[in-house]
Amino acid sequence: AGVFELQIHSFGPGPGPGAPRSPCSARLPCRLFFRVCLKPGLSEEAAESPCALGAALSARGPVYTEQPGAPAPDLPLPDGLLQVPFRDAWPGTFSFIIETWREELGDQIGGPAWSLLARVAGRRRLAAGGPWARDIQRAGAWELRFSYRARCEPPAVGTACTRLCRPRSAPSRCGPGLRPCAPLEDECEAPLVCRAGCSPEHGFCEQPGECRCLEGWTGPLCTVPVSTSSCLSPRGPSSATTGCLVPGPGPCDGNPCANGGSCSETPRSFECTCPRGFYGLRCEVSGVTCADGPCFNGGLCVGGADPDSAYICHCPPGFQGSNCEKRVDRCSLQPCRNGGLCLDLGHALRCRCRAGFAGPRCEHDLDDCAGRACANGGTCVEGGGAHRCSCALGFGGRDCRERADPCAARPCAHGGRCYAHFSGLVCACAPGYMGARCEFPVHPDGASALPAAPPGLRPGDPQRYL
């Protein structure tokens, strides 16, 4: 466990004559605040994915009013650091997004208005416990200068905050198998504290609070022997009685979400859905009012003038959650008809239609046959954006302009000879065969496997195919 710390040094216009006007004016005084979002750096997450490592909101900066005629200076900043606590190991490589927000303090109806001034992002390698790393980034006409570091919370140490340290019990040396804790040489590396009750014989841990089982043992505390008998249900009946294998502790076990938040598992970790009035990775931030600007992504905050009365975030299209922190996967509703591809552009939904379909939701079937003529008595058939002609007998091709050779496919079986005919084809069957395609053998006694031939047609006669 540990804390990521971000220090904003300055936010102001970039160099050069095209410097931006101050974001505040005498008529509209304003103040700045910052938001940081952290994600594991090498995750294959989409840009809109939640801040899996955590997020933080700064306090508000001092109120600033532009001095008429003066160039926009660096703007006054909030006091203190932005701190993002992390519970698990520090990943070493992380991605960040830092947003600079302006809060206008004019006489808006419904309270202050917020707007995003600048957003910077990056991916960096950073060892916990190292020195402050500095950065300078441009965002539009603005320039942001900041420093950041990750530090472990005692007793954790190390570049990933996974080793634990305890004060030495003896003045001279550490216990058996335990090394001194660099750089805290007066402390010793502590044995990991596994989940309470974890079997000392059959369980072990690589991180504090976990309980991993040796082969042949299962259960949350590794006290249940794995039996070879089959389980009756997918999870198995009560593992304590049968010894069936059950899934190990999940990320939501013990509900890491505080303040009544509900936990849902994600592919990599967990996500807390917080009740109104709370937010943060584990719903740990409370006493929030609209003055704290809790609504992200342009959400409008209503109510909550004092910490006891909850606020409500009215989210813009495409966002949801008590703080508008979750992007709605609007494509999951499959709004595009007729096989169209759905694109969520954030500000709007777009459907990329398959050929032959149009409209905002690909709902219009284009008339493929409009102005298309099929020759020689063929009829036009619509389908999937391409017109097709169903041709009259004896004709083929895309527009039924080609005279078809009905014998090209060798339709006469058993050596029968094919003759093209104005209304189709005729098969002259070889001795011993009959039928429209010479498909039936004639029995030696002269009887046919078919019902009696129509009058005037003897077995062996050419059978005309109508």
Epitope: I97, A121, G122, R134, I136, Q137, R138, A139, G140, E143
Partner: antibody, heavy 117, light 107 residues
């Protein structure tokens, strides 16, 4: 106006070292980083690393990590880049550039380094 | 390191033409892309940073767009002084990397 002026062309033998200077003027020297970028003949651009003149913190491209050194002299607003153990493939034009992590807004005129036996 | 693929690698056009050069990143780099112009024997010059911000002093006929993995540099009406090589550069991850360049020549 902002200017970055680099030292003159160099011809070196394989195995030797070269030290290129970059003198900054027209702005507060410690306010921006100085990056080094090189361009081999007819090739693209390759970032080598940067120095923060305030803290003397340096960060390098792994391709050069063990061969490059960057230093600065605040009294003359000059940054130096030294590349050791030169080989023929180090023949290139070496540029210094002012900037932060996501922009290089002013560049020096370039220094041609030729490595030949 | 993040790879940037520029296309086309060379392009012939006439004065007054509208020209588009594209740059594709091997992974999401948000809006951390810059465009540079380089003329023979000269240092590169910054044109666009953070995908669409025009550097001071750069003519407004140059514009940048895109975010994520796909980016575009557009010159709305080519001028004689625009014939040069153009490079894109990502600054999301360390080390910063450059595209292979697009050489814009007079037709």
């Amino acid at each position: 106006q902002v200017q970055l002026v680099q030292s003159g062309a160099e011809v070196k033998k394989p195995g030797a070292s070269v030290k290129v200077s970059c003198k900054a003027s027209g702005y507060t020297f410690t306010r921006y980083w100085i990056h080094w970028i090189r361009q081999a003949p007819g090739q693209g651009l390759e970032w080598m690393g940067y120095i923060n003149p305030t803290t003397v913190y340096t960060e390098f491209n792994q391709n050069f990590h063990d061969r490059v050194t960057m230093t600065r002299d605040t009294s003359t607003s000059t940054v130096y880049m030294e590349l050791s153990s030169l080989r023929s493939e180090d023949t290139a034009v070496y540029y210094c550039a002012r900037g932060g992590s996501n922009f290089f807004d002013y560049w020096g005129q370039g220094t041609t380094v030729t490595v030949s036996s | 390191a993040i790879q940037l693929t520029q296309s086309p690698s060379s392009l012939s056009a006439s004065v007054g033409d509208r020209v588009t050069i594209t740059c594709r990143a091997s992974e999401n780099i948000y809006y951390n892309l810059a465009w540079y112009q380089q003329k023979p024997g000269k240092a590169p010059k910054l044109l666009i940073y953070t995908a669409n911000s025009l550097e001071d002093g750069v003519p407004s006929r140059f514009s940048g767009s895109g975010s994520g993995t796909d980016f575009t540099l557009t010159i709305s009406s080519l001028q004689p002084e625009d014939f040069a090589t153009y490079f894109c550069k990502q600054a999301y991850d360390v080390p910063p990397t450059f595209g292979g360049g697009t050489k814009l020549e007079i037709k």
